[in-house]
C-alpha cells in the first residue's frame, strides 16, 4: 500500500474506493468519507491506505498498469476488474497494454520496443492459453452503464456521464470528476497532462484528465528540468 500519498486536486485520474474510517478535518470544504478529504482549488491532501481501483478499460489505469480481473490477465472477462501492475519484459501477455512502458506484446510475451505508441487495447494475436482462472461474474461492477428505460443512439458529449471512453464521442474520454465519470476532451499538444511517477498514485486523483491525443505523449516540459521532482510540469508532446 501507499501511505500518505500526496494528491493534487487539479491533477487527475481515478480515486480508489477506500475502506475504513471516516475522513474529516476542521475547516475543510467537504468531507469525502471514508478516508478521503478534499478542499477545492490547488490544495494538496493526503490519502492513506491505497486500494485497487475498479476499471473498465486500460485507459483508466496508470501508464504502468492495465485493466484486468485480478485472477486473470485479460480485460473484458466478466467479474470485477481493477488496475493491475504492468508485466515486465519476458512476462506473458495478451495485449500491448499489459506490458510495461517500452515493451509490447509479441507472441504472448512482453518484448522490448523502440516505439511506445501501440494502441493500448490491441489484442495480441495467436494466444490460445488463458493467463489465469476464469473469474465469475456478478461482482457488482457492471459492464455497462445504461438506463434500463432507454437505449443510447448517440455518444456522450462533454459533461455527459459515462462508464468507459467508448461511451463518449470522438475526441473525448471517460474521466473521473469527483463522484461521477464524465466525457472530457482528450488532451491536445501543449496541454498539461498527468504523469504517474509513483506506482499506483493515479488512484489518488479525484479530477481526472484525459490522456494525450493520438501521436502525443505525456513528457516533462523541457524548461522545467531544473525544478524539483515534485513540481515538474508534464505536457502532451509529439513523439
Amino acid at each position: 500500500t501507499l501511505n500518505s500519498v500526496l494528491i493534487n486536486s487539479n491533477a487527475i485520474k481515478n480515486l480508489p474506493p477506500p475502506l475504513g474510517g471516516a475522513g474529516g478535518q476542521p475547516g475543510s470544504a467537504v468531507s469525502v468519507a471514508p478516508g478521503v478529504l478534499y478542499e477545492g482549488g490547488n490544495k494538496y491532501q493526503t490519502l492513506d491506505n491505497y486500494q485497487p481501483y475498479p476499471c473498465a478499460e486500460d485507459e483508466e489505469c496508470g501508464t504502468d498498469e492495465y485493466c484486468s480481473s485480478p485472477s486473470r490477465g485479460a480485460a473484458g472477462v466478466g467479474g470485477v476488474q481493477i488496475c493491475l501492475a504492468c508485466r515486465k519484459r519476458r512476462k506473458r501477455c495478451m495485449r500491448h497494454a499489459m506490458c510495461c512502458p517500452g515493451n509490447y506484446c509479441k507472441n504472448g510475451i512482453c518484448m522490448p520496443s523502440d516505439h511506445s505508441h501501440l494502441p493500448r487495447g490491441e489484442i495480441e494475436e495467436g494466444i490460445i492459453e488463458n493467463l489465469g482462472n476464469d473469474h465469475g461474474a456478478g461482482d457488482g461492477y457492471p459492464r455497462r452503464t445504461t438506463l434500463t428505460s432507454k437505449i443510447y443512439h448517440t455518444k456522450g458529449q462533454e459533461g455527459s456521464v459515462c462508464l468507459r471512453s467508448s461511451d463518449c464521442a470522438t475526441g473525448l474520454c471517460c474521466a473521473r470528476h469527483f463522484w461521477s465519470k464524465i466525457c472530457k476532451p482528450v488532451l491536445k499538444e501543449g496541454q498539461v497532462c498527468t504523469k504517474h511517477r509513483r506506482k499506483g498514485s493515479h488512484g489518488l486523483e479525484i479530477f481526472q484528465r484525459c490522456y494525450c491525443g493520438e501521436g502525443l505523449a505525456c513528457r516533462i516540459q523541457k524548461d522545467h528540468h531544473q525544478t524539483s521532482n515534485s513540481s515538474r510540469l508534464h505536457t502532451c508532446q509529439r513523439h
Epitope: 470544504a29 467537504v30 471514508p34 438506463l147 474521466a175 461521477s180 472530457k184
Partner: antibody
C-alpha cells in the same frame, strides 16, 4: 421511466434523529452517483450529501454543514438511498430531495421531495 | 467555496418576450475544457428540473427556446420567447468544485 420517491420526513425535536429513504426505479441504480439536496422554506437549494456508483467504490461526500451529523448510504439490492440525520437543528428544516446524475454531470433526475421540520 | 450570484432577483416579463438571466461565479468554473455550470427551473411545490448542463448543453426533453452561454465566471440563461409555463424560479449551479453550490435564484414573473 426513471423514478425517485422520497419518504421518511416528518416533525422532529431539535437534537432528534430521522431517517429518509429514496426508492429508485427505471435505471441501473448501483451504477450511478446519487445525492440529497435540500431546500429550506422560501429559500434556495443546498447540496447535502452524495454517494458515488459502483465504478467509484460507493464513496460518500458531505459539506461541512452536515458532516458528522448526517450519513448517506445506499442499498443496491433494494434500489434504495438513505439519509440518516442525527443531532437535528432548526436550520435543517427543509424539503429534502434525492437527485441523481444519469446522463449528465448535473442533477438530471429528482424526486418529489419529503418535508423535514425540526421544531420544539 | 465558489459563490454564485444571480441577477436580477426578479424579472417581470410578458409571454412572448425574451428573458435573459445572469449567473456570476466568484471564480472560474471552467476546467478540462468544460464549463461546470448547470441551470434548473423550479415551479412552486415541484422539484427542480434540469434545463442546461455544462454551460450550454440542453438537458433531455428541454425545449429549444432555452439556451445557455458563457464561460469562466459569467453565464447566461436565455429564454428566447417566454411561454406561460416558463414563469418560475431559475437556479444556476456549479459542479466544478465540491461543495456544489447554487445561486440564489431568479424569479421570472408575469408582468
Amino acid at each position: 421511466e426513471v423514478q425517485l420517491v422520497e419518504s421518511g420526513g416528518g416533525l422532529v425535536q431539535p437534537g432528534g434523529s430521522l431517517r429518509l429513504s429514496c426508492a429508485a426505479s427505471g435505471f441501473t441504480f448501483s451504477s450511478y452517483a446519487i445525492s440529497w439536496v435540500r431546500q429550506a422554506p422560501g429559500k434556495g437549494l443546498e447540496w447535502v450529501a452524495s454517494v458515488s456508483g459502483t465504478g467509484l467504490g460507493f464513496q460518500t461526500y458531505y459539506p461541512d454543514s452536515v458532516k458528522g451529523r448526517f450519513t448517506i448510504s445506499r442499498d443496491n439490492a433494494k434500489n434504495s438511498l438513505y439519509l440518516q440525520m442525527n443531532s437535528l437543528r432548526a436550520e435543517d428544516t427543509a424539503v429534502y430531495y434525492c437527485a441523481t446524475s444519469l446522463e449528465n454531470y448535473a442533477f438530471d433526475y429528482w424526486g418529489q421531495g419529503t418535508t423535514v421540520t425540526v421544531s420544539s | 467555496e465558489i459563490v454564485l450570484t444571480q441577477s436580477p432577483a426578479t424579472l417581470s416579463l410578458s409571454p412572448g418576450e425574451r428573458a435573459t438571466l445572469s449567473c456570476r461565479a466568484s471564480e472560474s468554473v471552467d476546467d478540462f475544457g468544460i464549463s461546470f455550470i448547470n441551470w434548473y427551473q423550479q415551479k412552486p411545490g415541484q422539484a427542480p428540473r434540469l434545463l442546461i448542463y455544462a454551460g450550454s448543453k440542453q438537458g433531455s426533453g428541454i425545449p429549444a427556446r432555452f439556451s445557455g452561454s458563457g464561460s469562466g465566471t459569467d453565464f447566461t440563461l436565455t429564454i428566447s420567447s417566454l411561454e406561460p409555463e416558463d414563469f418560475a424560479v431559475y437556479y444556476c449551479q456549479q459542479l466544478k468544485e465540491v461543495p456544489p453550490t447554487f445561486g440564489g435564484g431568479t424569479k421570472v414573473e408575469i408582468k
